[in-house]
């Protein structure tokens, strides 16, 4: 769940010297304190696991450890979003969810985490070196991405611990601006606090938390999230070899390493217009409501504001045409 510090409610100022101006100077520090507390560097964690119940099924879980508002989540197979891999799912908090084979079920787990069940049967099952990447577009933090893969162990039910992304790219130039404002706000807050140091503290409602509580809450989204932040990265070096992917696993391997039956009739849908155009690697923040973003190197379909989640009846061909001109 997205964590935001709760601002303790203040008693209205007593009539007299402070007046309306005094009320403003008392509320402002708490607002600024909230901003300072929740303005940590966001991170994304990714967890990939093979299900014990269905050996050909994989679950990808991703979470965003930030306080901003998530506007889009993209799950990619093979590499970073927009790097020419396969988009498995796109989740929009308002417009809904789109997913493409072999993704079976994508859903929001909380306001800031998602899960995706990947149906892998034999040849479509990823090996331990296949990476899955989750990209979260949020405001005001920008665009943050992390990747994960199956753990080296082929034991079903085991999973790699959530992989944090210590070095993440903020795609928004404006982030520096936001950080600057917050920094200034924090300094200003200290200044205000010093000014009020010798004055009696405002009476807080007894039912509310103490001023220290927001800090603890803001930096501890959940136990799982905290654990994710401190998991050391371990290089995954397994026996999954590209040249032998169509044959048996070199070490016997898990039972899901069988060959995939072909589905000639299978006609996967190309990503929907709003879903198929990844967030640009650079540039200023573009609202999801404004028709999204065009990714160089792809041929995205037509984009525009009033786009729906319904699959394009033309299927994958809808992705053709330079910059959306069909």
């Amino acid at each position: 769940m997205r964590t935001e510090a709760q601002v303790p409610a203040l008693q209205p100022p007593e009539p007299g010297l402070e007046g309306a101006m005094g009320h403003r100077t008392l509320v402002l520090p708490w607002v600024l304190l909230t901003l300072c507390v929740t303005a940590g560097t966001p991170e994304v964690w990714v967890q990939v696991r093979m299900e014990a119940t269905e050996l050909s099924s994989f679950t990808i879980r991703c979470g965003f450890l930030g306080s901003g508002s998530i506007s889009l989540v993209t799950v990619s197979w093979g590499g970073p979003n927009g790097a020419g891999g396969t988009t498995l799912a796109v989740l929009h908090p308002e417009r809904g969810i789109r997913q493409w084979a072999p993704a079976r079920q994508a859903r929001w787990e909380t306001q800031s985490s998602i899960s995706l069940i990947l149906e892998g049967s034999g040849a479509s099952s990823p090996c331990a070196n296949t990476t899955f990447c989750c990209k979260f577009a949020s405001f005001p933090e920008g665009s943050w991405e992390a990747c994960g893969s199956l753990p080296p162990s082929s034991d079903p039910g085991l999973s790699a611990p959530p992989t944090p992304a210590p070095i993440l790219r903020a795609d928004l130039a404006g982030i520096l601006g936001v950080s600057g404002v917050l920094l200034f706000g924090c300094v200003y807050l200290l200044h205000l606090l010093r000014r009020h140091k010798h004055r009696p503290a405002p009476r807080l409602q007894p039912s509310r938390t103490s001023p220290q509580a927001p800090r603890a809450r803001a930096w501890a989204p959940s136990q799982a999230s905290q654990a994710a932040l401190h998991v050391p990265y371990a290089t995954i070096n397994t026996s999954c070899r590209p040249a032998t992917l169509d044959t048996a696993h070199p070490h016997g391997g898990p039972s899901w390493w069988a060959s995939l039956p072909t589905h000639a009739a299978h006609r996967p849908q190309g990503p929907a217009a709003w879903a198929s155009t990844p967030i640009p690697a650079r540039g200023s923040f573009v609202s999801v409501e404004n028709g999204l973003y065009a990714q160089a190197g792809e041929r995205p379909p037509h984009t525009g504001p009033g786009l729906t989640l319904f699959p394009d009846p033309r299927g994958p061909r809808a992705m053709e045409g330079p910059l959306g001109v069909r």
């Epitope: 990714v46 197979w77 093979g78 590499g79 970073p80 927009g82 790097a83 020419g84 891999g85 396969t86 988009t87 493409w100 084979a101 072999p102 892998g120 040849a123 479509s124 099952s125 990823p126 090996c127 070196n129 296949t130 990476t131 990447c133 991405e145 992390a146 990747c147 994960g148 893969s149 992989t163 944090p164 992304a165 210590p166 070095i167 993440l168 990265y233 070096n237 590209p242 040249a243 992917l245 169509d246 995939l260 072909t262 589905h263 000639a264 299978h266 996967p268 190309g270 990503p271 690697a281 990714q295 160089a296 190197g297 792809e298 041929r299 299927g315 994958p316 061909r317 992705m319 053709e320």
Partner: antibody, heavy 120, light 111 residues
Framework: QVTLKESGPGILQPSQTLSLTCSFS??????????VGWIRQPSGKGLEWLTH???????FYNTFLKSRLTISKETSNNQVFLKIASVDTADAATYYC????????????WGQGTLVAVST | DIVLTQSPASLAVSLGQRASISCRAS??????????MYWYQQKPGQPPRLLFY???NLASGVPARFSGSGSGTDFTLNIHPVEEEDAAIYYC?????????FGGGTKLEIK
């Protein structure tokens, strides 16, 4: 055993359209996570990625050549096609097709390549 | 675009010695520990052959005397001990973003 084989016209004139075919065996583009890409190499020079196509018909192109490239596939025949419009002498190269497996973004198996010359 | 710069452009190594080839990216190709960098070997008249994927994972059939390392922007391919059959041109390639690019190549000669 995975094999890929490129075929093309060998020689063509400037402004013509180059059509190349990649015929493969040992894998299928019906399989989730499978892709085929095209890479070229001018004589005595380095490699240049052009485009690739996934089993689900997702296509990706090199930005510089995007307007001239078209990749397509014929899944039932195990073939992938590349068209390059308005060729000039700079397009003379050995063209390779290569397999991408398990959704991964690297080229696992390569064809032997087909040499394309552009002459006036 | 990410530019990959290989060095040296060529090197001559005595049989049994170590060959070290560097590939430097103009921007990081690593995300949360995964480096989207690959190495290929190309012998005259042959297509490239995958040596390493994700920077350090040895591809099938590649001898253990080859090793790959690095993350972020700096990557290295080492061959030790070098054998006669290792004479070839070695290329690095990234897939961090589109377009994928290759390094200019390093020609390895055996003395």
């Amino acid at each position: 055993q995975v094999t890929l084989k490129e075929s093309g016209p060998g020689i063509l004139q400037p402004s013509q359209t180059l059509s190349l075919t990649c015929s493969f065996s040992g894998f299928s583009l019906n399989t989730s996570g499978t892709g085929v890409g095209w890479i070229r190499q001018p004589s005595g020079k380095g490699l240049e990625w052009l485009t690739h196509i996934w089993w689900n018909d997702n296509k990706f192109y090199n930005t510089f050549l995007k307007s001239r490239l078209t990749i397509s596939k014929e899944t039932s025949n195990n073939q992938v096609f590349l068209k390059i419009a308005s060729v000039d002498t700079a397009d003379a190269a050995t063209y390779y097709c290569a397999r991408m497996a398990y959704g991964n973004l690297w080229f696992v198996n390569w064809g032997q390549g087909t040499l394309v010359a552009v002459s006036t | 675009d990410i530019v990959l710069t290989q060095s040296p452009a060529s090197l001559a190594v005595s049989l049994g010695q170590r060959a070290s080839i560097s590939c430097r990216a103009s921007r990081s190709v690593t995300i949360s520990g995964y480096s989207y960098m690959y190495w290929y070997q190309q012998k005259p008249g042959q297509p490239p052959r995958l040596l390493f994927y994700l920077a350090s994972n040895l591809a099938s059939g590649v001898p253990a005397r080859f090793s790959g390392s690095g993350s972020g922007t700096d990557f290295t391919l080492n061959i030790h001990p070098v054998e006669e059959e290792d004479a070839a041109i070695y290329y690095c390639q990234h897939s961090r973003e589109l377009p994928y690019t290759f390094g200019g190549g390093t020609k390895l000669e055996i003395k």
